[in-house]
């Protein structure tokens, strides 16, 4: 492990779409690939006014933009399908929007899934 | 190095079977998803099937469900596609391609290619 | 079935050019888009993954950028060895779903 990296060995797995992909809906997933690799776990979900719908979690495979995010957090503006990913053990169980606006204070809507 | 050797096309009359084999090497082949991807000649990419890591999930284009079956043996490091009742519009090169999970398929080493021709 | 739309489906350019193809997927699909080269006679080669990560032993004169339905590469200064088919693939959902490609000829 490198000094100041959260290692990434498994996530939360989340397929609503399980049936149509043959997967499990709901689990948890080992985090494989190469060495030289960073992984990250991720969430994607929708807000149907104002439900929260979630589409898939699971491992994410080496993407700067998850580096050293210890949190799972969305911070594109009003996105149709949210995403985030973070680093370290099953860290996609909670995700949160956060919203990057430049001219209002951001307000954090934390989400803890509760996966039908 | 990651290798992926593909063999086993060749021509074959519309009804026949074919079986594909992509031998692995290179990389610990029991932890990544494959998939078969084909390309008819001058044509662009299709997908035809894909297998996670340990051959719990399958799943299959429409155009080739029910008559082709993906498979892998871990023990052999070898991935496999049985193709039956071919027709004339399976004629491609076949491609076996590695990716690191079941849902986040980007297809990160591809193999040379195995070209079948379905013709009579 | 998620279909992506590649433009334009061929361009000529010169070495040292900018050149920029894009792709349009029929329904949102995050940042969960690749690209992939495809000289002839050779098999298809990853390049970019998730969007705007760059694939393993690839030039950082390529770029990729965009999320949930318009998706763009960029080649910052062309090259004699990238002259060749680009495609765009969707990984958000079965069944994996390519663009047609899009041939970068030399001008």
């Known amino acids: 492990a490198i000094l100041g990296r959260s290692e990434t060995q498994e996530c939360l797995f989340f397929n609503a779409n399980w049936e149509k992909d043959r997967t499990n809906q709901t689990g948890v997933e080992p985090c494989y690939g190469d060495k030289d690799k960073r992984r990250h776990c991720f969430a994607t979900w929708k807000n149907i006014s104002g439900s929260i719908e979630i589409v898939k979690q699971g491992c994410w495979l080496d993407d700067i933009n998850c580096y050293d995010r210890t949190d799972c957090v969305e911070k594109k503006d009003s996105p149709e399908v949210y995403f985030c990913c973070c680093e370290g053990n099953m860290c996609n169980e909670k995700f949160s929007y956060f919203p990057e606006m430049e001219v209002t204070q951001p307000t954090s809507n934390p989400v803890t899934p509760k996966p039908p | 190095e990651v290798q992926l050797l593909e063999s086993g096309g060749g021509l074959v009359q519309p009804g026949g079977s074919l079986r594909l084999s992509c031998a692995a090497s290179?990389?610990?082949?029991?932890?990544?998803?494959m998939n078969w991807v084909r390309q008819a000649p001058g044509k662009g990419l299709e997908w035809v099937s894909g297998?996670?890591?340990?051959?719990?999930?399958?799943s299959y284009a429409d155009s080739v469900k029910g008559r082709f079956t993906i498979s892998r043996d871990n023990s052999k490091n070898t991935l496999y596609l049985q193709m039956n009742s071919l027709r004339a519009e399976d004629t491609a090169v076949y491609y076996c391609?590695?990716?690191?999970?079941?849902?986040?398929?980007?297809?990160?080493?591809w193999g040379q290619g195995t070209l079948v021709t379905v013709s009579s | 079935d998620i279909q992506m739309t590649q433009s334009p489906s061929s361009l000529s350019a010169s070495v040292g050019d900018r050149v920029t193809i894009t792709c349009r997927a029929s329904?949102?699909?995050?940042?969960?888009l690749n690209w992939y080269q495809q000289k002839p006679g050779k098999a298809p080669k990853l390049v970019i993954y998730?969007?705007?990560s760059l694939a393993s032993g690839v030039p950082s004169r390529f770029s990729g950028s965009g999320s949930g339905t318009d998706f763009t590469l960029t080649i910052s200064s062309l090259q004699p060895e990238d002259f060749a088919t680009y495609y765009c693939?969707?990984?958000?959902?079965?069944?994996?779903?390519f663009g047609g490609g899009t041939k970068v000829e030399i001008k």
């Open positions: 391609a590695r990716s690191a999970t079941w849902h986040d398929t980007h297809l990160d080493y």
């Open positions: 290179g990389f610990t082949f029991s932890s990544y998803s």
């Open positions: 297998i996670n890591y340990n051959g719990g999930y399958k």
């Open positions: 329904q949102s699909i995050v940042r969960y």
């Open positions: 998730a969007a705007t």
């Open positions: 693939q969707q990984s958000y959902e079965l069944p994996l779903t």
